[in-house]
Interface confidence: low
């Protein structure tokens, strides 16, 4: 009967997704998939002693064991507000509602006599209302609320007398409600009833420490279920034609070492000791798992052969619960030293392998939020998205027969040992209110959408387009700071003397007096690492190369008193040698990469960008670079990502905004200097590059998140773009937001006030828009106190684990770049835009498929922006040429200069100018586009040193 679930952990342990479809499936669920929502009677009904209801073991437990909780009475009051529950179900559009019957509400002392009329009326009304709405009821007979009288009289589930009493109760329910109920659950999560009720004492009746009692209770629960199944099968199924099962709950677990047989064995033991304890007898061979029998010996009761036959096969489908109750508290779990995991897909695979591919109803799934979270339960959306995506993959990719899904729970309510400290509802209920209104949370809206679409539709993207970028498009690659070689590596032609060797037989060199030869002038190829750069660039087939100068190397003292001519010569060589290969340079003057900011030491010690003298020093440095390199360089970036640099000055918001102000002025002065002194002769263009990730609301159902997404863009991009591209001043939205927080005493930050002269200085000091775009961030509003830039924005980020992302958690969201480009054009007008850095880190050292996927998808979106949105996109610079050791692997080349396969991919993209249709020929002449010539590459590699 039983299979072996161990194979689940032997699947590719090192699998890393490299495209979206491997991680997240945009697809629909099967046609008649059963969508539902669930509640437990004790959790939501309230009215614990109203209208003749008897007390349950949980009512007693709450009074005796739970601190600060007087009763379950507050709850959501479903017993009183049935109509409100029905409206909530209507809102979501479910196909079924899973609820439990409160045994003591029907039979106050547990024994089946005449049913309590008011209780009976409640359940009849509920069932009739569901049938009227075409909502299928799934009814649980026992969700932990045993009549207290049975506990006190018999010792509860420890006593096998309860088996027959439970069967009587079930018989009554089948007789009374069976005409309207086609799906029955006998017991909800018997593992927790036994383990926490009698082992840890965390659940009612709160007994603990007696392991024999735990397994006796488990034994009686199995026998009770089995008896009820046979009862239904014999007496009710023939005319009611329903199905009956038991809901079994479990965690999931992953081995510490995926290749380690012992760790996998421990994972198997962990699953068997929880899920297998009940599933093996019921869904397997009728007996407990061998491992449990060996380990527990006399503690575990025995099934006789007759009982095994009786128990085996007593479930018409596999009802599976996967939620927080099986994951807490961690210290009571059967982890066996391995790692608990929320991978529902793997758990379903284990059930498929272990129990012969049964039909599965997910009878409980969901997570929880803190009690203070009201309707904006953003994390709940992502948990649901993740779980549902795993279920969909299990169905579509693993061929697991899941036929229904129960989101848990319909309402906030009483959460067992956590009482009212957590919430699990799709609907928010204020427990202190009289009317107990059910307010849909974001997760309710999300689930409603899932049900309406029967899954996940891909509505984020416009279909791919075929087309090409313009012929003068800059196909570039970006490198960070190039450290100049301080000494040319090959000075062999700088000695003017002639030598004779071994003239006297002493094997020495003798200088010939009176003879002086012409020395070879210094050559660019004297620098070894320029040769390396050129080799890599030639293989990239790019038209443009963006790199940064090292300010501290060019001007070690920070001023023009000590110019490092060798460094300037090195940089001139990089540019001129590149030009020989048809590769133009985009040169960045200042590219801070480290906490030391890349400033000359004296400037750093004087306060760095908090000191206005750094501004003057930068202008002088820029002038020097324009003068020395400007005849060869036509594209300049003054400062790379000043909007990121400023967060180093994060002692206070005022430091941040002060540093940013000085960076803006430094850029503007450099631009004005170029405009005035160098543009007439050099005819170049100057800008600064901004870090420009796109932002989306983490919760699309929350207005505050939409506002937070726009605010992120204002604080991140507009902060620098507005003064330079548009008004000469900081964005009004940013200024107002900070001022408002200041007024409310939440922050002492203030944006600097700009004089008219400063506004005139800043405004219009860009010749093009340069954006560094890597990813899209999911942002949410969270009011943060404090006077730092980070807290001034009131923004937190959310990582969507269902999204494809890189090792450093950069999400691959191609459509974000198109949205960004459209936003920039809408806000700052029709201007030339260069994407000056864009890329992803990819662990692969050779076949970097994630990078290829990223390039293809992001460039496709840039092309849409160009062709459909008419954005004047002038160039795309992939980041970056070579990776640095011990850093995330963003490079096309490894740190020891080995080429990765994405290079060929980028080559192809460049040679075809984008995504041409099958029959279109290249529109661009070879003179307009750089092509790699084999001889050139050979010469570059073989140039003498």
């Amino acid at each position: 009967f039983s299979g072996d679930g161990r194979a689940v952990w032997s699947k590719n342990p090192n699998f890393t997704p490299v495209n979206e479809s491997q991680l997240f499936l945009y697809d629909t669920f099967p046609k008649n998939f059963f969508w539902g929502v669930g509640t437990g009677a004790l959790q939501v009904e309230g009215s614990w002693k109203k209208d003749g209801k008897g007390p349950s073991i949980w009512d007693h437990f709450v009074h005796t064991h739970l601190k600060n909780v007087s009763s379950t009475n507050g709850s959501s009051d479903s017993y009183i507000f049935l109509e409100k529950d029905l409206s909530a179900l209507d809102f979501i559009g479910v196909s079924f509602y899973q609820f439990s019957i409160s045994w003591p509400r029907l039979f106050p002392d547990g024994i089946v006599t005449v049913a309590n009329a008011k209780g009976l009326q409640y359940y009849n009304t509920l069932l009739d209302s569901l049938v009227l709405r075409n909502i299928e009821p799934i009814v649980t007979l026992y969700h932990w609320d045993l009549p207290l009288a049975l506990q006190e009289k018999y010792g509860g589930w420890k006593n096998d007398t309860i088996i027959d009493i439970f069967n009587d109760y079930a018989t009554y329910c089948f007789q009374t409600f069976g005409d309207r109920v086609k799906y029955w659950i006998t017991i909800h999560n018997p593992y927790l009833v036994a383990w926490h009720g009698y082992g840890t004492g965390m659940h009612a009746p709160g007994e603990k420490g007696n392991l024999a009692a735990v397994y006796t209770v488990g034994h009686n629960l199995i026998k009770a279920h089995s008896k009820v199944w046979h009862n239904y099968n014999t007496h009710f199924r023939p005319h009611q034609k329903g199905w009956l099962s038991i809901t079994l709950g479990s965690h999931w677990i992953e081995p510490n070492r995926s290749e380690n047989t012992m760790d996998i064995l421990k994972c198997q033991q962990s699953m068997v000791s929880v899920l297998g304890w009940f599933a093996s007898p019921i869904h397997g061979d009728g007996d407990y798992p061998e491992g449990m029998k060996k380990k527990l010996l006399s503690i575990l009761p025995l099934f006789s052969e007759a009982e095994k036959n009786e128990v085996r096969g007593t479930a018409d489908f596999f009802a599976f619960s996967f939620g927080p109750n099986n994951f807490k508290p961690l210290n009571t779990m059967a982890k066996m030293g391995q790692n608990v995991s929320l991978n529902l897909r793997e758990a379903l695979n284990w059930i498929k392998l272990e129990y012969n591919n049964p039909q599965i109803l997910i009878a409980e799934n969901g997570w929880f939020t803190d009690s203070h979270v009201k309707t904006e339960d953003t994390t709940a959306i992502y948990m649901m998205k993740n779980f549902l995506s795993q279920v969909l993959q299990a169905i579509r990719l693993d061929e697991i027969r899941v036929f229904g899904y129960t989101a848990w729970s319909l309402l906030d309510g009483f959460e067992w040992q956590d009482a009212y400290t957590i919430r699990r509802g799709l609907f928010y209920v204020d427990f202190n209110s009289k009317q107990k209104e059910r307010k849909p949370k974001s997760s309710a809206h999300y689930y409603k959408q899932i049900i309406r679409e029967n899954g996940f539709s891909l509505k984020e993207a416009t279909p791919d387009v075929q087309g090409q970028f313009p012929c003068d498009f800059s196909w570039g690659v970006t490198e960070s700071v190039l450290k100049p070689e301080s000494v040319a590596s090959s000075p062999q032609f700088s000695d003017p003397y002639l030598y004779v060797w071994n003239a006297t037989g002493n094997r020495l060199l003798h200088r010939v007096e009176g003879v002086r030869l012409k020395t070879r002038p210094a050559q660019c190829t004297d620098f070894v690492n320029i040769k390396k750069q050129l080799e890599m660039l030639a293989r990239m087939k790019v038209t443009h190369y963006r790199f940064a100068l090292d300010w501290a190397s060019v001007l070690p003292t920070g001023n023009l008193s000590a110019v490092n001519r060798q460094a300037l010569r090195y940089y001139r060589c990089v540019v001129s040698e590149g030009l020989k290969l048809g590769i133009s340079a985009m040169v960045t003057l200042y590219y801070p990469t480290h906490a030391h900011l890349g400033l000359p030491e004296p400037l750093l010690h004087a306060g760095g960008w908090l000191n206005p003298s750094t501004v003057e020093a930068f202008q002088a440095y820029a002038g020097l670079c324009f003068q020395e390199l400007g005849d060869l360089v036509k594209l300049w970036i003054t400062i790379n990502e000043p909007n990121r640099l400023s967060d180093i000055y994060n002692r206070s918001g005022n430091d941040t905004y002060g540093a940013a102000h000085n960076l803006l002025v430094a850029h503007a002065l450099a631009w004005r200097l170029y405009d005035r002194q160098f543009r007439p002769s050099q005819r170049g263009a100057v800008s600064l590059s901004l870090h420009a990730d796109w932002a989306e609301p983490a919760n699309p159902y929350a207005d505050s998140h939409w506002r937070a997404a726009e605010r992120f863009l204002q604080f991140e991009i507009a902060w620098f773009a507005e003064p330079l591209f548009k008004t000469g001043d900081y964005p009004a939205a940013m200024r107002e937001y900070i001022a408002s927080k200041h007024r409310r005493g939440l922050s002492s930050s203030a944006l600097p006030r700009l004089t008219e002269a400063e506004r005139r200085l800043l405004k219009g000091t860009v010749d093009f828009c340069a954006l560094n775009h890597f990813t899209t961030r999911f942002v949410m509003h969270e009011q943060l106190a404090g006077s730092r830039y980070d807290s001034d924005r009131d923004i937190q980020f959310l990582q969507d684990i269902t999204r494809l992302s890189s090792p450093t958690r950069l999400a691959v969201i191609p459509w974000g770049v198109r949205k960004l480009l459209r936003w920039v054009r809408r806000n700052y007008g029709d201007m030339d835009i260069y994407i000056t850095a864009s890329g992803i880190d990819d662990q692969a050292l050779e076949d970097d498929r994630l990078r290829k996927y990223y390039l293809e998808k992001y460039l496709q979106e840039v092309l849409k922006a160009y062709l459909i949105d008419k954005v004047r996109i002038k160039g795309y610079y992939a980041f970056k040429l070579a990776e640095e050791k011990s850093k995330p692997r963003f490079g096309f080349f490894t740190s020891d200069f080995k080429a990765k396969s994405s290079i060929q991919f980028y080559n192809k993209m460049i040679s075809s100018s984008g995504f041409p249709s099958e029959n279109s020929s290249s529109r661009c002449s070879q003179t307009q586009k750089n092509t790699e010539c084999t001889v050139c590459l050979f010469l570059v590699q073989k140039k003498p040193l």
């Epitope: 990469t593 730092r788 011990s886």
Partner: antibody
Framework: QVTLKESGPVLVKPTETLTLTCTVS??????????VSWIRQPPGKALEWLAH???????SYSTSLKSRLTISKDTSKSQVVLIMTNMDPVDTATYYC????????????????WGQGTTVTVSS | SYVLTQPPSVSVAPGQTARITCGGN??????VHWYQQKPGQAPVLVVY???DRPSGIPERFSGSNSGNTATLTISRVEAGDEADYYC???????????FGGGTKLTVLG
Amino acid sequence: QVTLKESGPVLVKPTETLTLTCTVSGFSLNNARMGVSWIRQPPGKALEWLAHIFSNDEKSYSTSLKSRLTISKDTSKSQVVLIMTNMDPVDTATYYCARSVVTGGYYYDGMDVWGQGTTVTVSS
Amino acid sequence: SYVLTQPPSVSVAPGQTARITCGGNNIGSESVHWYQQKPGQAPVLVVYDDSDRPSGIPERFSGSNSGNTATLTISRVEAGDEADYYCQVWDGNSDHVVFGGGTKLTVLG
């Protein structure tokens, strides 16, 4: 300027749980470039890394002590807390917290500022 | 997990150059950071990313890293340089910080 200050009990009994707090100032625990590590040093012995918490709340623990450690942060209080269960006399040491700088939001650049350390003795 | 090996002690006369090594499998492909710790004090970062110096650290401190050995070099050693020195890397495979066992630098005389 940037400072970190450790606080916690001086004396702990065997089997008890140690809770240490690192209060930071001069930088934000939200800042994408900042992370905080806990390191300890038994008397006369080498530094031993215990745990690290990144700005995005990701956590990393020393393999040998993983089952006993929990690191967390409270950004609003500018505090990082380390909890170490089941203390033993061999855990007697000076416990340091240190800021680690990452650049570009992702790269690890060493621990540039350390607290002065708090000495914890485990004895019955 | 990744292991870093340092010599327990290094002695050097004032004014001379001290070299402290840190061995590790292919350590050249890792970024190495060096800390100085004087008795009774907390460690101080003296070199990061193989060879970069934080501001305030004298130019006498330099670092290099290739192959299986990283080296901290202290030129023109002074009595005040006497301390324990630790190398450290971030092991990206396990997301763990790894310290070397430390080297005691003694300044003779």
